[in-house]
Interface confidence: low
């Protein structure tokens, strides 16, 4: 055993070197053990093959020390590793494409607070098994294409704190047993219209604290189990462009943040959840000043599937362009309700299950609320029907709710054309979760504190600073 | 398994605050809203609002919207509820409860703190 | 506000017999899109917090007996207990979790004979 370290055999062959001032990665480490903890040291680098003889290693801790540097090969040979934590080293800065290829048992993987600015093409290639991945609060400013395509068991993502300005098409392809994924306090201006396409699963999504002005309900309509949506602390802009988002929020089933307007004037800290659908008429701005995506091809209003701005009818400008004129009393909603469930005379619906404003999908018995995972039993399937389309308001077809509302034929309650998830009823936590004491950051994962504790949903024991925490 | 623990009884006069306190344990705190409820004596539940303990967002009932203020504390695990300018309509039973998988289903429950506002 | 209205009050039965109450909502709890019911019952026992027993109408919780049977759509609803037990002594809540805000029935008091 190293003379900095503690060994010790039960439950789980152990080598313990916690805040020992470590500048490197001791020597000596018994290649029986199982877990290897190095938190909170001085550790720079991690040299190739540093632990290449532990072959039945399960869980390596190096976060909170000063890694600039981490060698391709550092990993190389941990076939059975389950849990490896690199965070808090804000000088790593970048990690090798290559670093964690061979890591087929890995289920969880931290990398936040590591001052990241990027993720290598190809940098979680073959990680079928990851469950968590922790890359909050570092400096990314994209996200690739493709950079978690082989996830396909991965349940949580945590990219919050970072300097993400889109979320092009692919960027969570591949996502399929996606259950929370965190992408609050970033830079988010866009978001394409298929970028949440896989993601079936998902029951939270944060996009609060972006930049976001509109968001084409389009992106949201593959999400039927979600039920926790956050959008408030966005500069949204609650015109004509707003009403498919309008009326997706209406028919949507779960939890959902205030949405405040901040355009145009009128309607300035208004919630968009409760405008009536009259107030969305016309255009905030004159022009679109969103181009979501750097293309030659593509105009903004094909890409995000909305038209640059509506015309407004010559009777509409006054209304669009006074900042005087009185807002709408609104459609008087409470809560979360959205009138598309309306009974006739009974005042405003609720929200449901799969509430897909494209027809019924198929339900299913529900399990208990303990037993209810992600990772269950396949969610409903998307509906077969597609949105009703009619002749428009330029010179594409459009649905009618991008033009001006009121003409005759289009409705004014916004629920023909809605487009909505089929929202399952399920929200955030588990019971099978563990709370252990301690607790520096929010929403993150898998730590624990003290002598080794049984965590019956990873069924391993493991020792550590508590300062993450599982969660569902 | 999951807990909520509050204190049993609290005691205020009238025109005076009181936090009342939920200690949270055995599951991920972050991970699950919370809510308040009130039951006044012999009578049914009035729901006071819920809080996200990632980030303290609130959504409150209408109606107590100026008397109860939810807070949490990440690092001790705890939600607190500011019940402030206390009638004797404010006596009762104040029960915190966490928001389950499913949306606005309550799965586990507190005990409860009985408050009692008397001069 | 959606407000729940629940029958009778209270009831006596012995052990062994069918318990059967009653909640009703002012508006429809039923999803016109997916035939889901958005009530809860809850079972308080005397000095206790409530306990969650079904949701979706008809769901039972975890380790809640199958004597428990939640049934009933749109705006009518039925807990049923099939033969009650002595620990069964509790009221009994209905609970609409369609909307904010969260509204509760006045309970139903089962007592035993």
């Known amino acids: 055993c190293p003379g900095a370290c503690v060994c010790y055999n039960e439950p789980k062959v152990t080598t313990s070197c916690p805040q020992q001032g470590l500048q490197a990665v001791p020597t000596g480490i018994p290649a029986s053990s199982q877990r290897i903890f190095l938190h909170g040291n001085r550790i720079s680098y991690v040299p190739a093959a540093s632990f290449q003889s532990c072959r039945n290693l399960t869980i390596l801790w190096l976060h909170s020390n000063a890694l600039a540097g981490i060698d391709a090969a550092a990993f190389t040979g941990l076939t059975l590793l389950e849990q490896l934590d690199l965070s808090d080293n804000a000088q790593l800065r970048v990690v090798d494409p290559t670093t964690f290829r061979g890591l087929g048992h890995l289920h969880t993987l931290h990398l936040d607070r590591c001052g990241l600015q990027e993720l290598g093409p190809g940098l979680f290639r073959g990680l079928a098994a990851l469950q968590y991945l922790y890359l909050q609060d570092n400096n990314l400013q994209a996200l690739p294409d493709n950079t978690f395509r082989d996830l396909g068991n991965l349940t949580h993502l945590f990219l919050h704190g970072n300097r993400i300005p889109s979320v092009p098409e692919h960027a969570f392809r591949g996502l399929h047993s996606l259950d929370r994924l965190l992408l609050h306090q970033n830079h988010v201006a866009r978001v394409h219209p298929h970028a949440f396409r896989d993601l079936g699963r998902l029951m939270t999504l944060y996009l609060f604290a972006n930049n976001l002005s509109m968001l084409p309900a389009e992106v949201l309509v593959p999400l039927r189990s979600l039920q926790y949506l956050r959008l408030n602390d966005n500069p949204w802009v609650c015109d004509c462009r707003a009403r498919p988002l309008w009326a997706w929020l209406q028919k949507f089933r779960g939890s959902s943040s205030e949405v405040p307007c901040n355009l145009p004037q009128r309607l300035a800290g208004r919630d968009l959840k409760r405008l009536a659908a009259s107030d969305l008429e016309g255009c905030a701005v004159a022009s679109g000043p969103f181009r979501p995506f750097q293309t030659n091809q593509l105009t903004d209003e094909e890409l995000l599937g909305l038209p640059k701005c509506c015309q407004p009818d010559a009777a509409d400008k006054a209304s669009v362009l006074e900042p005087g004129r009185p807002a709408s009393a609104g459609n008087a909603l409470k809560g979360r309700v959205p009138p598309g469930d309306t009974p006739p005379g009974n005042g405003s619906g609720p929200r449901h299950i799969n509430d897909s404003p494209f027809g019924t999908l198929p339900g299913s018995a529900e399990p208990p609320l303990t037993a209810l995972r992600p990772g269950g039993s396949e969610p409903p399937g998307l509906p077969t029907t597609g949105p009703r389309r009619r002749p428009g308001c330029s010179r594409k077809n459009r649905t009618r709710s991008h033009c001006r509302l009121g003409q005759a034929g289009s409705g004014s309650s916004g629920t023909g054309d809605a487009e909505g998830s089929g929202a399952l009823g399920i929200r955030k936590g588990n019971s099978a979760d563990i709370q252990h004491s301690g607790g520096r950051s929010s929403l993150e994962g898998p730590r624990f504190e003290g002598k080794p504790i049984p965590n019956p949903l990873l069924g391993l024991d493991s020792t550590r600073t508590g300062h993450h925490h599982h969660h569902h | 398994q999951v807990q909520l623990q509050q204190p049993g009884i609290e005691v205020v006069k009238p025109g005076a605050s009181v936090k009342l306190s939920c200690k949270a344990s055995g599951y991920t705190f972050i991970s699950n809203w919370m809510h308040w409820l009130r039951q006044r004596p012999g009578q049914g539940l009035e729901w006071i609002g819920e809080i996200d303990p990632s980030d303290t967002y609130t959504d409150y009932n209408q109606k107590f919207k100026g008397k109860a203020t939810l807070t949490v504390d990440k690092s001790s695990t705890t939600a607190y509820m500011l019940l402030s300018s206390l009638t004797s309509e404010d006596s009762a039973v104040y029960f915190c409860?966490?928001?389950?998988?499913?949306?606005?289903?309550?799965?586990?429950w507190g005990q409860g703190t009985s408050v009692t506002v008397s001069s | 506000d959606i407000v729940m209205y629940q029958s009778p009050s209270s009831l006596a039965m012995s052990v062994g017999q069918k318990v059967i109450m009653n909640c009703k909502s002012s508006q429809s709890l039923l999803s016109s899109n997916n035939q889901k019911n958005y009530l809860a019952w809850y079972q308080q026992k005397p000095g206790q917090s409530p306990k969650l027993l079904v949701y979706?109408?008809?769901t039972r919780d975890s380790g809640v007996p199958d004597r428990f049977i939640g049934s009933g759509s749109g705006t009518d609803f039925t807990l049923t207990i099939s033969s009650v037990q002595a620990e069964d002594l509790a009221d009994y809540f209905c609970?609409?979790?369609?909307?904010?805000?969260?509204?509760f029935g006045a309970g139903t008091k089962l007592e035993l004979k």
């Open positions: 409860a966490r928001g389950g998988m499913i949306v606005y289903v309550l799965d586990s």
């Open positions: 979706f109408a008809s």
């Open positions: 609970q609409q979790h369609y909307t904010t805000p969260l509204t």
